[in-house]
Interface confidence: low
């Protein structure tokens, strides 16, 4: 079954290459187990950035080497992507799956355009 997912249209990454945004889903039921995946779309290519499965009320656990961190609160997931550079500018899509209990629900957001601007190098001091 389809599920509505909302996320901001545009986010500007910080000068340290960190971007945060909220992914909110309209849960049709009382899910206990949720999977959140961040997809990046650029030049018509879609790649998985990171994914986490979590139990409602618990923290999201991404893989140790993931560039993502996150927290959950009700039907909202606060996602943070780190280590971004200008070349990582693109559309970041939030995909939410209600894993348990059945029925399975899938929702895909319209995407958040993340703009990353590499900081200007500091000029050499005399």
């Amino acid at each position: 079954k389809a599920m509505h997912v909302a996320q901001p249209a545009v986010v500007l990454a910080s000068s340290r290459g960190i971007a945060s945004f909220v992914c909110e889903y309209a849960s049709p039921g009382k899910a206990t187990e949720v999977r959140v995946t961040v997809l990046r779309q650029a030049d018509s290519q879609v790649t998985e950035v990171c994914a986490a499965t979590y139990m409602m009320g618990n923290e999201l656990t991404f893989l140790d080497d993931s560039i993502c961190t996150g927290t959950s609160s009700g039907n909202q997931v606060n996602l943070t992507i780190q280590g971004l550079r200008a070349m990582d500018t693109g559309l970041y899509i939030c995909k939410v799956e209600l894993m348990y209990p059945p029925p399975y629900y899938l929702g895909i957001g319209n995407g958040t355009q993340i703009y990353v601007i590499d900081p200007e190098p500091c000029p050499d001091s005399d």
Epitope: E33, E97, P103
Partner: antibody
Framework: EVQLVESGGGLVQPGGSLRLSCAAS??????????VGWIRQAPGKGLEWIGE???????YYPPSLKSRVTISRDNSKNTLYLQLNSLRAEDTAVYYC????????????WGQGTLVTVSS | DIQLTQSPSSLSASVGDRVTITCRAS??????LAWYQQKPGKAPKLLIY???SLESGVPSRFSGSGSGTDFTLTISSLQPEDFATYYC?????????FGQGTKVEIK
């Protein structure tokens, strides 16, 4: 290498119970993003989903079998169990356990199956 | 439960033939469909997942397509080892259900 090995099949009397085991190796049954299902196949018939256990330990059974089936696991032994009660002749089948990943839900690894015959 | 109907139930074909098997779902299952091959006395083997993704190690002559309610498994050039029974399976909603199977026999 991922492997699933079922055991516990054999001849069971009608009205009796069966307890099958599925020993997993090459991955942990409690690993995030992985679930395991039980599937059966009656002689000369198609495949039927019996139930599943999620990495969290949550279980799900089809309504038609819910009153008779229990799936559990022992994390220390990395083993999955299927208990089926009030057996009848139509429960005669080869029983398989199979693993899937939440990313695709395709059953990518299967056990060899164990035959259960319900007969007096 | 979601019903999956495969057609044909059986077919006869020769080595080198192009074979197409269809699977129709009783409701929209997006792309949550897998295809399996089963040989007598053996466990099923995953061929295709997510309707069109080829499982690692599966020959490229196997391909899947479709979304929503209509899906197709195609074997572009049938090989001797491809004579088997093929099943579709949906994972969109529990309980996950299988099609009734399509037996591919030698003509």
């Amino acid at each position: 290498e991922v492997q699933l090995v079922e055991s516990g099949g054999g001849l069971v009397q009608p009205g009796g119970s069966l307890r099958l085991s599925c020993a997993a190796s090459g991955f942990s049954l409690s690993t995030g993003g992985v679930g395991v299902g039980w599937i059966r196949q009656a002689p000369g018939k198609g495949l039927e989903w019996i139930g599943e256990i999620y990495h969290s330990g949550s279980t799900y059974y089809p309504p038609s079998l819910k009153s008779r089936v229990t799936i559990s696991r022992d994390n220390s032994k990395n083993t999955l169990y299927l208990q089926l009660n009030s057996l009848r002749a139509e429960d005669t089948a080869v029983y398989y356990c199979a693993r899937y990943e939440y990313s695709s839900y395709g059953l990518d690894y299967w056990g060899q199956g164990t035959l259960v015959t319900v007969s007096s | 439960d979601i019903q999956l109907t495969q057609s044909p139930s059986s077919l006869s074909a020769s080595v080198g033939d192009r074979v197409t098997i269809t699977c129709r779902a009783s409701q929209d299952i997006r792309k949550f469909l897998a295809w399996y091959q089963q040989k007598p006395g053996k466990a099923p083997k995953l061929l295709i997942y997510d309707a069109s993704s080829l499982e690692s190690g599966v020959p490229s002559r196997f391909s899947g397509s479709g979304s929503g309610t209509d899906f197709t498994l195609t074997i572009s050039s049938l090989q001797p080892e491809d004579f088997a029974t093929y099943y579709c399976q949906q994972s969109y909603r529990s309980p996950r259900t299988f099609g009734q199977g399509t037996k591919v026999e030698i003509k």
